[in-house]
């Protein structure tokens, strides 16, 4: 194949691949008709002048995972047809000025996972056709104004995993075609107003894992096409009332792992396309009426691991499409009987690890499609009569780790549990806490004769009009554990970003222990 070097493999399709630690320089002679050249996992430390001079038809050049630390300015001379150049995963600290001169067809430039300390406007001034620039995983501390001014066709820019402490409001101003901007895992503490104003076609903005404390009210007001906004794992303590007002296309918003203390009504929206909202690991203490009312298509709402002690009865107004609601690991002691009334499509509700001491009898009254209810690790002593009777699809109910009071008042619940044992799962069953003579015994098989008369606890409101024993039980005879899929954190859906959080059994969604983390 036109003289394939011995240390390389060459295919009929003009593809050349050279790999191996024994390679210490660009192999020669390379086939003149090569269109794709990959030099991977070698011990090449430098690229000298014009090593690719005779393969001017080259379209794609990957020089990755080498020991490359030095490149001569003329290394890529005569590669006018080159469209894709990757120098990722090397040891480059400095890019020579003019290195990319003459690469008039270059569309993708990957410089990620090196040790670059700085970039300058002159580095990319010749790359007017560039569409993708990957600079993540370097040691960049700042981006000078003008660095990207000539890249007017750029659609994807990744600056994640660097050491950026601030961003100039002018640095992105000429990138009107940019669709993806990633600034995750830097040290940004604030983003100046106007920074993203020129990015009118932006679809994805990744700002997670920085140290951002405040968001300017109009920071995203020009980004009407934004679909994915990642703000998780920052230090955001409050959201300006209008900060998300101009984002009608948004379908992904992550805010978990911040310091949010409160959410004001209408803060989200209108966002008719938002399907998931992740707010776990904040410091939210209460949810006011209508706080999510603009999110008409929301299907997943994760509010776990906050400090929520109060939920206003109308907090979930508007969430008619909600399927999954996670409120576990908060400080809830009471719930209003109407708080879930609007959630007609709710399938899974996660209330474990709270301080609930009782539930209103009508708490699930309008939520007929519930399939999974997590109530373990609360302070429940009994449940109102008939609370689950209408939930014909219920196949998972977790009630363990509550201080069940096994006096005569518990008998209706015990009898219902006897009929519906498969729904409780086999791993852990609820046990009596009081009286002391039955402590530790299974609530399901508790000896009725041992249970003592009701004691001084005030009566829990009950609903006798709802029969405990329907003539024909409407419950499916099923041993299915769960229909849910455990999610521990939203996976940022792009391949070069691995920020999936690992959690233990205090996980953020926690539908079942088997599914967690």
């Amino acid at each position: 194949y036109h003289g394939c070097p011995s240390e390389c493999t060459c295919s009929r399709a003009s593809q050349v691949e050279c790999t191996g630690a024994r390679i210490v320089a660009v192999p020669t002679p390379l086939p003149w008709n090569a269109m794709s050249l990959q030099i991977l996992n070698t011990h090449i430390t430098e690229l000298n002048e014009s090593p690719f001079l005779n393969i001017s038809a080259l379209i794609a050049l990957r020089i990755e995972k080498n020991e490359l630390s030095r490149i001569t300015p003329g290394a890529f001379r005569n590669l006018g047809s080159l469209r894709y150049l990757s120098l990722a995963n090397n040891k480059l600290q400095v890019l020579p000025i003019g290195l990319f001169q003459g690469l008039d067809s270059l569309e993708s430039l990957l410089l990620s996972s090196n040790q670059l300390l700085q970039i300058q406007p002159a580095h990319f001034s010749q790359c007017s056709n560039l569409k993708e620039l990957q600079l993540h995983g370097n040691h960049l501390e700042y981006i000078p104004d003008g660095a990207f001014d000539h890249l007017v066709g750029l659609t994807k820019l990744n600056l994640g995993k660097n050491s950026l402490t601030h961003i100039s409001p002018r640095v992105f101003q000429h990138l009107g075609n940019l669709q993806v901007l990633r600034l995750y895992e830097n040290r940004l503490t604030d983003i100046p107003m106007g920074t993203f104003d020129g990015l009118v076609n932006l679809q994805e903005l990744a700002l997670q894992q920085n140290q951002i404390g405040l968001l300017s009210p109009g920071l995203f007001h020009n980004n009407h096409n934004l679909q994915r906004l990642y703000l998780s794992n920052n230090h955001i303590s409050q959201l300006p009332p209008s900060v998300f007002m101009q984002l009608p296309q948004l379908n992904r918003l992550t805010l978990f792992g911040n310091s949010l203390k409160e959410l004001s009504p209408g803060i989200f929206g209108p966002m008719p396309n938002l399907r998931e909202l992740w707010l776990y690991d904040n410091h939210i203490s209460s949810l006011p009426d209508n706080v999510f009312s603009n999110l008409r298509q929301l299907q997943v709402l994760i509010l776990s691991r906050n400090q929520i002690s109060f939920i206003s009865p109308g907090a979930f107004n508007g969430l008619t499409e909600l399927r999954e609601l996670s409120l576990h690991t908060n400080a809830l002691q009471d719930l209003d009987g109407n708080v879930f009334r609007m959630l007609a499509n709710l399938q899974n509700i996660s209330l474990q690890n709270n301080r609930l001491r009782q539930l209103p009898g009508n708490i699930f009254a309008n939520v007929n499609g519930l399939m999974a209810i997590q109530l373990q690790n609360n302070q429940l002593e009994n449940l109102p009569l008939g609370i689950f009777d209408h939930l014909g699809k219920l196949c998972e109910l977790r009630l363990y780790d509550n201080p069940w009071r096994c006096d005569s008042d518990i008998l209706p619940l015990r009898n219902w549990l006897l009929l519906n044992q498969p729904r409780l799962g086999t791993d852990t069953v609820p046990v009596c806490f009081s009286p002391a003579n039955v402590r530790g015994q299974s609530l399901i098989i508790i000896n009725v004769n041992v249970a003592v008369p009701s004691v001084h606890v005030p009566e829990v409101p009950s609903y006798p009009e709802t029969p405990w024993y329907p003539d024909t039980p409407s419950y499916p005879d099923t041993t299915s554990v769960s229909s849910t899929t455990e999610l521990t954190s939203p996976v940022e859906d792009y391949t070069d970003l691995t920020t999936i959080q690992v959690t233990d059994d205090r996980s953020v969604w926690g539908m079942t222990q088997a599914q967690s983390g």
């Epitope: 474990q352 363990y400 046990v431 402590r439 606890v457 005030p458």
Partner: antibody, heavy 120, light 112 residues
Framework: EVQLVESGGGLVQPGGSLRLSCAVS????????VHWVRQATGKGLEWLGV???????NYNSALMSRLTISKENAKSSVYLQMNSLRAGDTAMYYC??????????????WGQGTTVTVSS | DIVMTQSPDSLAVSLGERATINCKSS????????????LAWYQQKPGQSPKLLIY???TRESGVPDRFSGSGSGTDFTLTISSLQAEDVAVYYC????????FGGGTKVEIK
Amino acid sequence: EVQLVESGGGLVQPGGSLRLSCAVSGFSLTSYGVHWVRQATGKGLEWLGVIWAGGSTNYNSALMSRLTISKENAKSSVYLQMNSLRAGDTAMYYCATHMITEDYYGMDYWGQGTTVTVSS
Amino acid sequence: DIVMTQSPDSLAVSLGERATINCKSSQSLLNSRTRHNYLAWYQQKPGQSPKLLIYWASTRESGVPDRFSGSGSGTDFTLTISSLQAEDVAVYYCKQSYNLPTFGGGTKVEIK
């Protein structure tokens, strides 16, 4: 007879970790919760966390990122794992349970404690 | 977190006299539906593990002498030893379990 016996204390380097054990007898861990509480010399009591009969856990929010409580029901043992230790973690560590009390978070049976010293 | 503040830090009382210890919480410990105040008192004698005396603010644990009594509701609570005995020399702690438990700083009771 109900008994709780702590072990695993001793000298630990700053930045290190500890794993304390609480061996229980006279009751089953599938029926009762077990708390961990610590007390620095001459200081007050500090609740660390609890593991309930079903395996759910609650933690002191100030220490949550460094604590893990687990158990092996078959071995009648509860464990406290604590990471990134500092001098302020030097204390007597107790495990306790709610055997008779009507107070769900009450602790009416205690072990004798095991001493942890964090020092270089 | 709920902060529990005990007063006084120490207390010297003659044998047979009344000892009163106060405990204040940073928020109410009363649950309006169960009508319980989620406050407990513990006694710790020198060199010993703590012992539960009183829970739900005023309910004595079984086996606790009736000279120990608890009172109060909401945010203000009191432990009273009506007639101090020599064996009552100890440090007394209040503890809330309305939210995840927190202890007060302790009150040392000595004989005058």
